[in-house]
Amino acid sequence: KELKVTQPEKSVSVAAGDSTVLNCTLTSLLPVGPIRWYRGVGPSRLLIYSFAGEYVPRIRNVSDTTKRNNMDFSIRISNVTPADAGIYYCVKFQKGSSEPDTEIQSGGGTEVYVLAK
């Protein structure tokens, strides 16, 4: 099946201190390689979360990503602050061994607006 990365929401609004879910689904797990969430684009983009075993405070996967056929790579960000505002991208990589992983497709992005409480 052809790989497609889908972020259904173009934007989400969340009150400071609350949590929000950023949705991302894939149509294929091939080629093998990690899925990562970034805020922003280009060389200065910020890695927010990687589905590769690393622990990140305030961020959790929504589904059981240890299922071998899991294609839901949505994340929940808790205790949102104004600094979390921005556009978030779900990005699928093809594994690299001697070389870095290769980005092969990105979702369309979801903008997070943080509202004052």
């Epitope: 797990l29 091939l30 093998v32 059981d64 240890t66 071998r68």
Partner: antibody, heavy 118, light 107 residues
């Protein structure tokens, strides 16, 4: 420190059943997929079955499908392998193993020996 | 099926390479597992093609390209004598497989 302790092995007759256990400690058990791997005497490693962190999804090699059942109890930090209709070919050391994010293995149990003999 | 040499030998201090072929780079991740004696617990020396667990010495390294993976031991030591199994996870079939094992003898 991550620790996996296998138990439940022993000597059984062909056709009988056995339930293996693996007690996990030193990590958040409910966050990791787990697998069972065996090694017959003088042979290599053979992956048998895997289970997702939540326990809802299971995976088996064809040769044990329908005879073996992998399960887990996250409240007890324990992994299980129910083995039915055992044959002499099932004689092996059985290891539990913790899976990495991409379903390889990073930690292994010490193993428990299962002998099927009449 | 994964194919690896039955045995390799080296003198202390030499570099050893053990290859494992038969996987598809597009759908496969490789790992390497050390077993010092039959029936003893395997130890993971490499997972995810090239990731070394924190407690494994830096002389162990891994790589993968095309349909093969390679375990390299740079400056092999007597205590590295063991059987090394390559393993693979296939994201197409959701199945794990292992090679038959390579016996490393340090002369």
């Amino acid at each position: 420190d991550v620790q996996l302790v296998d138990s439940g092995g022993g000597v059984v007759r062909p056709g009988e059943s056995l339930r293996l256990s693996c007690a996990a400690s030193g990590f958040t058990f409910s966050s990791y997929a787990m697998s069972w791997v065996r090694q017959a005497p003088g042979k290599g490693l053979e992956w048998l079955a895997g289970i997702s962190a939540g326990g809802s999804d299971t995976y088996y090699i064809d040769s044990v499908k329908g005879r073996f059942t992998i399960s887990r109890d996250n409240s007890k930090n324990s992994l299980y392998l129910q083995m039915n209709s055992l044959t002499a070919e099932d004689t092996a050391v059985y290891y539990c193993a913790r899976e990495t994010w991409n379903h390889l293995f990073d930690y292994w149990g010490l193993g428990t020996l299962v002998t099927v003999s009449s | 099926a994964l194919t690896q040499p039955a045995s390799v030998s080296a003198n202390p201090g030499e570099t050893v390479k053990i290859t494992c072929s038969g996987g598809d780079y597009y759908s496969t991740y490789y790992g390497w597992y050390q077993q010092k004696s039959p029936g003893s617990a395997p130890v993971t020396v490499i997972h995810s093609d090239d990731k070394r667990p924190s407690d494994i010495p830096s002389r162990f390294s891994g790589s993968a390209s095309g349909s093969a993976a390679t375990l390299t031991i740079t400056g092999v030591r007597v205590e590295d004598e063991a059987v090394y199994f390559c393993g693979a996870y296939d994201g197409r079939t959701y199945i794990n497989t292992f090679g038959a094992g390579t016996t490393l003898t340090v002369l």
